[in-house]
Interface confidence: low
């Protein structure tokens, strides 16, 4: 009897949908695996007789529930199927946005870039999929614990009247208010302000 794949799960970030599993212990030899998806009531092969423990399902429609399954195989024997259900638009992880930060005197000017989507047009981003897409920004003085939060209305934001000659750190994430779903934070970007623009008399 061939044991089934273990710890079957979908690892999906920005609609790059990778079904992953672990190979069970099997004394007779090396196992191969077949992964399928349900399409119009018929299961279609996606990865056949692979020795890998993952299969890329990024071409699935972003909408609706998909039934995926995987089994282990050895010679003419095979395990039972292990099924999972996956809805990309609900289940994919929102990866960190990109961010450009520029210091102008005592202001920080930030521009946000929504994460790109795998297997789509080059210009296609998460913002194109989710109508309610917005950004959460948090910033803080470097070396302090108190963080301040903004929900920008656009793809850019300006923090004005900051303390001069002070290092501020900023990070951003995607947020979907209608789904109450937050993405992953970007790595903090830290920049030092310069002088304020007031000219002494």
């Amino acid at each position: 009897m061939v044991p089934p794949p273990e710890n079957v799960r979908m690892n999906s970030v920005n609609f790059k949908n990778i079904l992953q599993w672990e190979s069970p212990a099997f004394a007779k030899g090396n196992l191969t695996f077949t992964a399928q998806y349900l399409s119009y009531r018929i299961f279609q092969d996606k990865c056949m007789n692979t020795t890998l423990t993952e299969c890329d399902f990024s071409s699935l429609s972003k909408y609706g529930d998909h039934t995926l399954r995987v089994r282990a195989e050895f010679a003419d024997e095979h395990s039972d199927w292990v099924n999972i259900t996956f809805c990309p638009v609900d289940d994919t992880i929102i990866g960190p946005p990109g961010m450009q930060v520029e210091v102008l005197a005592d202001s920080l000017h930030m521009r946000f870039l929504a994460p790109k989507i795998e297997n789509e047009y080059e210009t296609w981003t998460m913002k194109n999929v989710y109508n309610s897409w917005t950004y959460n920004v948090q910033y803080w003085k470097n070396g302090t614990d108190e963080k301040f939060q903004i929900t920008p209305q656009y793809d850019f934001e300006v923090l004005r009247n900051l303390e001069p000659w002070t290092t501020y750190c900023v990070q951003v994430r995607g947020f979907l208010p209608d789904r109450n779903k937050a993405g992953e934070w970007s790595e903090p970007v830290c920049e030092q302000t310069t002088h304020d623009e007031t000219v002494p008399s």
């Epitope: 301040f148 939060q149 903004i150 209305q153 656009y154 300006v158 109450n180």
Partner: nanobody, 123 residues
Framework: EVQLVESGGGLVQPGGSLRLSCSAS????????IGWFRQAPGKGREGVAC??????????NYIDSVRGRFTISRDNSKNTVYLQMNSLRAEDTAVYYC??????????????WGQGTMVTVSS
């Protein structure tokens, strides 16, 4: 240390109006999000409205059950946030709390809380 003090609660008839105020002290940034949560008797705390000042204006966010009836506003010069509540209903009866850093209205994950002000809607 941020301190929040709510006021303006009371007893009002269905269809009536109230204006809640939240006075904040200890802020070092006008950009912090700040908003209102509420907790009805025997229920969990829920978000009501959240407001964020940005470099170009104000972004306000409401839960569906109050949208169109409640209006959140803020006066940064006074470090005060207001909740204008119109067309009040019995189901709006709750203790209303002011809180900072209100990312998500549907989960009360905020950083600093006031002591609350009671709003009772009853005939």
């Amino acid at each position: 240390e941020v301190q929040l003090v709510e006021s303006g609660g009371g007893l009002v008839q269905p269809g009536g109006s109230l204006r809640l105020s939240c006075s904040a002290s200890g802020f070092t940034s006008p950009y912090s999000t700040i908003g209102w949560f509420r907790q009805a008797p025997g229920k969990g705390r829920e978000g009501v409205a959240c407001i964020s000042s940005s470099g170009r204006g104000v972004n306000a966010n409401y839960i569906d059950s109050v949208r169109g009836r409640f209006t959140i506003s803020r006066d940064n010069s006074k470090n005060t946030v207001y909740l204008q509540m119109n067309s009040l209903r019995a189901e709006d009866t709750a203790v209303y709390y002011c809180a900072t850093n209100c990312w998500r209205l549907t989960s009360p994950a905020a950083d600093n809380w006031g002591q609350g002000t009671m709003v009772t809607v009853s005939s």
